[in-house]
Amino acid sequence: TQNKALPENVKYGIVLDAGSSHTSLYIYKWPAEKENDTGVVHQVEECRVKGPGISKFVQKVNEIGIYLTDCMERAREVIPRSQHQETPVYLGATAGMRLLRMESEELADRVLDVVERSLSNYPFDFQGARIITGQEEGAYGWITINYLLGKFSQKTRWFSIVPYETNNQETFGALDLGGASTQVTFVPQNQTIESPDNALQFRLYGKDYNVYTHSFLCYGKDQALWQKLAKDIQVASNEILRDPCFHPGYKKVVNVSDLYKTPCTKRFEMTLPFQQFEIQGIGNYQQCHQSILELFATAGCPYSQCAFAGIFLPPLQGDFGAFSAFYFVMKFLNLTSEKVSQEKVTEMMKKFCAQPWEEIKTSYAGVKEKYLSEYCFSGTYILSLLLQGYHFTADSWEHIHFIGKIQGSDAGWTLGYMLNLTNMIPAEQPLSTPLSHSTYV
């Protein structure tokens, strides 16, 4: 008689990343008997929820259930029915909801309550929805990329995961850019972390890590743009804002009420003699860069070194994975290649921003105008943030690797979050050998 294939002994987990601009659902899978091995968990599905981030549903919470339906139904299809009940579902909300909570805790709670009610209706093991801290967001992003890169494995490998890799055991730093916040997380070299709020201690797979992390609320790309507009409109002579961060010929009307809706613009708020103003693009990278730099005004630095806003930042150390919007924006601009120097990136940004809006629209006809119009700002912002904000140099730029996926799993905080909540990262080194790894994209 022929041997019958045994059913796969696998487990699944679902994490929803409720970001400021959108929600994504990730499905992870791993062999049940190898839970404690490093590198065995991988992503099998990403489902991007249609619509904005959950914080935008504050006045229409009754629509949240429908909003989540498609992706939750997709999860139902992907995961075998027999495993639905034992599959944990976690929802983590990030800076968009942190900002809403700052405005009104009650409204933030109401949104999360409805999210929880909706997710409880599915056959999975729903574990609740919560607003994760900026520190968690940074830490779990760091765990994710290092887990996927095999940095926690104590086994010596004959192959290299990445072409430029030197010391296999040196962890990567993590650079995460969202719509409302940005995180920087890395292991500093023999440097005491002068600010306790920025220090994390981990013991993972038998090794201790002293990690620096900080989340800059309001410095995600969307909130940074709102900040820049609020700052620049203060000195505008009328209701026309000539903006170097938008392409020549680009025009857009902005409501002052929308500009001042977010807590991120409070520091620039003033009474303006108009209810609306018009952005008129002039497409000048250098001027855009200068305007953005004003957002990084380093008031006083009570430490040996600061990033900006008086926040401690140790000297940068080692290689960094830059993901989420760092990757999406640079990928669109075709600037993710290892071979592109910082000087070349700057040159290309100058050319891109100077291109007329009509030309840009024709060249990228398939891209939504809302997103297309903001790539000049976003690209310039990424350069400004990395160079002036975090003090990368032309030389250390080569240590930044723009990463979308590693071994088919998205770089981001969600995998690290699930690994932690399912107790799949042991403090001590397990005895079994890890799986092999392939390269990242």
């Epitope: 909570r101 805790e105 709670d109 999360l112 309550d113 929880e116 009610r117 409880s120 574990q127 609740g128 929805a129 919560r130 607003i131 801290t133």
Partner: antibody, heavy 121, light 107 residues
Framework: QVQLVQSGAEVKKPGASVKVSCKAS????????MHWVRQAPGQGLEWMGR????????WYAQKFQGRVTMTRDTSTSTVYMELSSLRSEDTAVYYC??????????????WGQGTLVTVSS | EIVLTQSPGTLSLSPGERATLSCRAS???????LAWYQQKPGQAPRLLIY???NRHTGIPDRFSGSGSGTDFTLTISRLEPEDFAVYYC????????FGGGTKVEIK
């Protein structure tokens, strides 16, 4: 809608213990802390402590430490408050009250109907 | 622990009048950590104001909160018959404490 339903009135002798329950419904039980507050007849409100139903961690007011125990049963969405070594001055109405989500601020949004505990020999 | 002192102990007013209730802390309290509750006889307390000045869902706009540091105020702009009750302030700083209460009674 959110409801907190408490167990019925109790009469206890001095030195005994009392266990009051509070059953929550209408929301995700694990997501909000639960507090206990008491009110002696004709007196003001006195905070006793809180429990995080997600992990079971507790924080008790100094005055009640060693005498109060707060627990939860996630399968029934119920929290319990047990007070031991009862004395006459523990005669009061005991309220459970839903507190904050993690990262929120400590105010008590929703209260149970109260449970009268009378301590008398 | 932070002690909250409410004054006056009793406030005798007529419907339609303005009520001003005071809550003083023994040390500075972050505004986000101060709340006000209303309690009627035989009922559980009800949250009115949180974060010193934010009205809880469903609370009429005649109720307003203000203050910072050690001095906080609850104002009822025009007393309605249903507003006659006891009012408590509450703070959070490691532990929760309540003020002794102010009784608003009909004159």
């Amino acid at each position: 809608q959110v409801q907190l339903v408490q167990s019925g009135a109790e009469v206890k002798k001095p030195g005994a213990s009392v266990k009051v329950s509070c059953k929550a419904s209408g929301y995700t039980f694990k997501s909000y802390e639960m507090h206990w507050v008491r009110q002696a007849p004709g007196q003001g409100l006195e905070w006793m402590g809180r429990i995080n139903p997600s992990v079971g961690s507790t924080w008790y007011a100094q005055k009640f430490q060693g005498r109060v125990t707060m627990t939860r049963d996630t399968s029934t969405s119920t929290v319990y408050m047990e007070l031991s070594s009862l004395r006459s001055e523990d005669t009061a109405v005991y309220y459970c009250a839903r507190g904050k989500r993690e990262g929120g601020t400590e105010y008590l949004r929703k209260w149970g109907q109260g449970t009268l505990v009378t301590v008398s020999s | 622990e932070i002690v909250l002192t409410q004054s006056p102990g009793t406030l005798s007013l007529s419907p339609g009048e303005r009520a001003t209730l005071s809550c003083r802390a023994s040390q500075s309290v972050a505004s986000s950590y101060l709340a006000w509750y209303q309690q009627k006889p035989g009922q559980a307390p009800r949250l009115l104001i949180y974060g010193a000045s934010n009205r809880h869902t469903g609370i009429p706009d005649r109720f307003s909160g203000s203050g910072s540091g050690t001095d906080f105020t609850l104002t009822i702009s025009r007393l309605e018959p249903e507003d006659f009750a006891v009012y408590y302030c509450q703070q959070y700083h490691n532990a929760i404490t309540f003020g002794g209460g102010t009784k608003v009674e009909i004159k």
